[in-house]
């Protein structure tokens, strides 16, 4: 069987369909969840929906073979199989591997380290989100793009604040957290600022090493 991969965001409505036309005048068509759990079957001109976790949120289009699933959740991750029984008794099957991902949560930026080193300021920030498999990208005045959860940089003495943005993303969504840092290097926590909620399109968080229990929201 042919295998197609699909990645969608949780809570969305999904159409599972094949890119080719169905065999002409097929006898029966069945959608399975995994190898053998029937979801819906078309036979003798009518659709039969089976008792399953999909009942009430799926619909079959017998013309195209498309299966519509509403409000998909991560638990719907699976390989879906459409098997068609043709008039001559031969079968055709198509498989769709559905991956349902939650939108990434807003990242928390944590100050891991901040110290004076030879008149320069060594800064180590980490971008934290709870238990997700995501991609990280840091933006700001950096020698090169950093693509992991930790940013380490050494700042020359400067008068103006520097801002660093951590972008977390998966294949269905992305969110940013931005941290702005003002000299001197070991200044009080109040001098570290977050970009305002409006600029970021949502509330962001900063956690300093010294004060893990008090989040600063702006």
């Amino acid at each position: 069987g042919r295998l197609v991969h699909m990645t969608v965001v949780s809570g969305s409505n999904v159409t599972l369909n094949i890119s080719e036309s169905l065999p002409e005048n097929y006898k029966q068509l069945t959608w399975f969840y995994t190898f053998d759990q029937k979801i819906v079957e078309w036979d003798s001109g009518k659709s039969k929906y089976f008792e399953s976790k999909f009942k009430g949120r799926v619909r079959l289009d017998p013309q195209s073979g498309a299966l519509y699933i509403s409000k998909v959740q991560k638990e719907d991750n699976s390989t879906y199989v459409m098997r068609v029984l043709k008039k001559d008794g031969y079968e055709q099957e198509w498989k769709i591997k559905l991956q349902v991902l939650d939108p990434v949560p807003k990242p928390v930026i944590k100050i891991e380290k901040r110290e004076d080193v030879d008149d320069n300021c060594y800064l180590k920030l980490s971008c934290v989100i709870p238990g997700e498999s995501v991609n990280y990208t840091w933006y700001g005045e950096l020698p090169k793009e950093i693509q992991n959860s930790v940013l380490e940089t050494t700042l020359k003495p400067h008068k103006h604040s520097r801002c660093y943005t951590c972008q977390v993303s998966n294949s269905v969504s992305s969110k940013n957290g931005t941290f702005c840092f003002s000299p001197p290097c070991t200044a009080a926590r109040s001098e570290q600022k977050l970009i305002s909620e409006e600029d970021l399109g949502g509330e962001q968080k900063l956690i300093s090493e010294e004060d893990l229990h008090h989040h600063h929201h702006h």
């Epitope: 069987g1 006898k27 029966q28 995994t34 190898f35 053998d36 079957e41 036979d43 003798s44 039969k48 390989t79 098997r83 029984l85 008794g89 031969y90 079968e91 099957e93 498989k95």
Partner: antibody, heavy 117, light 107 residues
Framework: QVQLVQSGAEVKKPGASVKVSCKAS????????IHWVRQAPGQGLEWMGI????????RYAQKFQGRISMTWDTSTSTVFMELSSLKSEDTAVYYC??????????WGRGTPVTVSS | DIQMTQSPSSVSASVGDRVTITCRAS??????LAWYQQKPGKAPNLLIF???SLQSGVPSRFSGSGSGTDFTLTISSLQPEDFGTYYC?????????FGQGTKVEIN
């Protein structure tokens, strides 16, 4: 033309295991299923399980769960069925059948397995 | 598991006779039913799939009908080569289950 070619007769002692092979020769299918069905002397047909060598999916009848295993060698288009902890009641002809999910349009000639002390 | 019950368990008929075998499923199986013929010492052979579709190469004197729970295999004019045991099998669900078989003998 497509054939399912099975391994030869086996004689086993109670408690032993048997491994029967089934080779799909002449097939050009990208996707096919192999079922195993057995028939005790003078008895009817009993379905044991199904495997899809292409994606590794298997499903066994509850009765055999825990002592049956279906494996495959895709390079030689051969499927294997191993049954362990043999009892005299396992004396039967073991058929592989396929190549469809629903119906068995093709059958091997059967492998007689005798379990006797 | 779905139980499949065949009747009669055996039938003896003459060449040219019409022979009917019935198969009842313990629950609705739509038209997911197959009929097989088995001759002594041989593997079964698919006759009918999807309750009423004739497998390629099978003589047209064999026909199948029914849906839901009640199914019939009919041999319209029995031929000498039609002796053997006939099995129905549901393919709606796992485990696939067979009827106990109907032995057809020629008078």
């Amino acid at each position: 033309q497509v054939q399912l070619v099975q391994s030869g007769a086996e004689v086993k002692k109670p408690g032993a295991s048997v491994k029967v092979s089934c080779k799909a020769s002449g097939h050009t299918f990208t996707n096919y299923y192999i079922h195993w069905v057995r028939q005790a002397p003078g008895q009817g047909l009993e379905w044991m399980g199904i495997t899809n060598p292409n994606d590794g999916n298997t499903r066994y009848a509850q009765k055999f769960q825990g002592r049956i295993s279906m494996t495959w060698d895709t390079s030689t288009s051969t499927v294997f069925m191993e049954l362990s902890s043999l009892k005299s009641e396992d004396t039967a002809v073991y058929y592989c059948a396929g190549l469809r999910y629903w119906f068995f349009d093709l059958w091997g000639r059967g492998t007689p397995v005798t379990v006797s002390s | 598991d779905i139980q499949m019950t065949q009747s009669p368990s055996s039938v003896s008929a003459s060449v040219g006779d019409r022979v009917t075998i019935t198969c009842r499923a313990s629950q609705d199986i739509s038209s997911w039913l197959a009929w097989y013929q088995q001759k002594p010492g041989k593997a079964p052979n698919l006759l009918i799939f999807a309750a009423s579709s004739l497998q390629s190469g099978v003589p047209s004197r064999f026909s199948g009908s029914g849906s839901g729970t009640d199914f019939t295999l009919t041999i319209s004019s029995l031929q000498p080569e039609d002796f053997g045991t006939y099995y129905c099998q549901q393919t709606d669900n796992f485990p696939r289950t067979f009827g106990q078989g109907t032995k057809v003998e020629i008078n």
